[in-house]
């Protein structure tokens, strides 16, 4: 088929990088600057993506392969091939409408990104908290309440509801 | 394939204008968006970038040159020139008429044209 | 303006292996292109985009390019691999073309 097909469209015989030129007999012209072609056969080369504003450069067009962006420092990416940059917020934070928003109790984030989740609910797998939790950690569990020695005590915090206005944007 | 071809007068006195041109053939100057560059080589040194044109007529050229330097296009005979004016003998060279096309390539060359400036 | 950086000179003895390094700020992000130029000769392309090669130029030729350093590498060096090589970018920043000084390869 493929044989075939090269007899039958010439275009098929350019490679990456060119273009099937029709103001030239379809001769395979090399893309010009600020283009690229990622695939054999194409009729025309693709724009470069330009990394501006709150986007960077990782590495730039070439004549195969589009730029590649990632974000400003106190930025990430989201998004296939960095498509957005959002705001990173400290520790202890989750990014909502208004800004970065310390962590509610009994919630934590340890990342710059993403948004708070509820501490480890220790009871659940019949553990009692070893380490308390704080907004950037979660809570360590240690053995089960039986297994302490005598005298030894332990605090298991209620599981916490997530308070109104800090649910994930 | 494109074939770039630079020509013009080999000595040029001091103070006056160099003037060079490159014709292209196998394809049309104005046509696909390429940057049409001139480049020199100063006897036994390496090579200089001197500027570059695009079909729009907009043009960027070396800071170093850029207050002497002016390139131009002429589609109608499928030739972009060269202007430096106020030449010394420091700009004693081998000229070069080049295309560029993607991520700044360079390609094909011109094969080059000696400039000597002497009075 | 962008600088690019090439050792002066490279020695390297036949069927060895030959690397010029080309330096540059970040020059990582960059897209490196390499030229050959013998004694009276125009530039030739040998390797562009970092580390393709154009039709007709032998495998033994290949680039690299990360952080501030990219890196032209001719295996089994013979003497006609004997010239001047110059990396070359283009600089989006100002829009200008940048050679790097060149090396000239010698081959013992």
């Known amino acids: 088929f493929e044989r075939t097909r090269s007899l039958q469209d010439p275009c098929s015989n350019c490679p990456a990088g060119t273009f099937c030129d029709n103001n030239r007999n379809q001769i395979c012209s090399p893309c010009p600057p600020n283009s690229f072609s990622s695939a054999g056969g194409q009729r025309t080369c693709d724009i470069c993506r330009q990394c501006k504003g709150v986007f960077r450069t990782r590495k730039e067009c070439s004549s195969t392969s589009n730029a590649e962006c990632d974000c400003t420092p106190g930025f990430h990416c989201l998004g296939a091939g960095c498509s957005m940059c959002e705001q990173d917020c400290k520790q202890g934070q989750e990014l909502t409408k208004k800004g970065c928003k310390d962590c509610c109790f009994g919630t934590f984030n340890d990342q710059k990104r993403g948004i708070c989740r509820p501490w480890t609910n220790c009871s659940l797998d019949g553990k009692s908290v070893l380490v308390n939790g704080t907004k950037e950690r979660d809570v360590v569990c240690g053995p089960s309440p039986a297994d302490l020695s005598p005298g030894a005590s332990s605090v298991t915090p209620p599981a916490p509801a997530r308070e109104p206005g800090h649910s994930p944007q | 394939q494109e074939q770039l071809q630079e020509s013009g007068p080999g000595l040029v006195k001091p103070s006056q204008t160099l003037s060079l041109t490159c014709t292209v053939s196998?394809?049309?100057?104005?046509?696909?968006?390429?940057?049409w560059s001139w480049i020199r080589q100063h006897p036994g040194k390496g090579l200089e970038w001197i500027g570059y044109?695009?079909?729009?007529?907009?043009?960027y050229y070396n800071p170093s040159l850029e207050r002497r330097v002016a390139i131009s296009l002429d589609t109608s005979k499928n030739q972009f020139s060269l202007n430096l004016n106020s030449v010394t003998v420091a700009d004693t060279a081998v000229y070069y008429c080049?295309?560029?096309?993607?991520?700044?390539?360079?390609?094909?060359w011109g094969q080059g044209t000696l400039v000597t400036v002497s009075s | 303006s962008y600088v690019l950086t090439q050792p002066p000179s490279v020695s390297v003895a036949p069927g060895q292996t030959a690397r010029m390094t080309c330096g540059g700020d970040?020059?990582?992000?960059?897209?490196v292109h390499w030229y050959q130029q013998k004694a009276g000769q125009a530039p030739v392309l040998v390797v562009y985009?970092?580390?393709d090669r154009p039709s007709g130029i032998p495998d033994r030729f290949s680039g690299s390019n990360s952080g501030n350093t990219a890196t032209l590498t001719i295996s089994r060096v013979a003497a006609g691999d004997e010239a001047d090589y110059y990396c070359?970018?283009?600089?989006?920043?100002?829009?200008?073309?940048?050679f790097g000084g060149g090396t000239k390869l010698t081959v013992l």
């Open positions: 080049a295309r560029i096309v993607a991520a700044g390539r360079i390609d094909p």
């Open positions: 196998g394809g049309s100057i104005n046509s696909q968006g390429y940057y």
């Open positions: 044109i695009y079909d729009s007529g907009s043009a």
């Open positions: 970040n020059i990582g992000i960059k897209i």
């Open positions: 985009d970092d580390n």
């Open positions: 070359q970018v283009w600089d989006r920043r100002s829009d200008h073309v940048v």
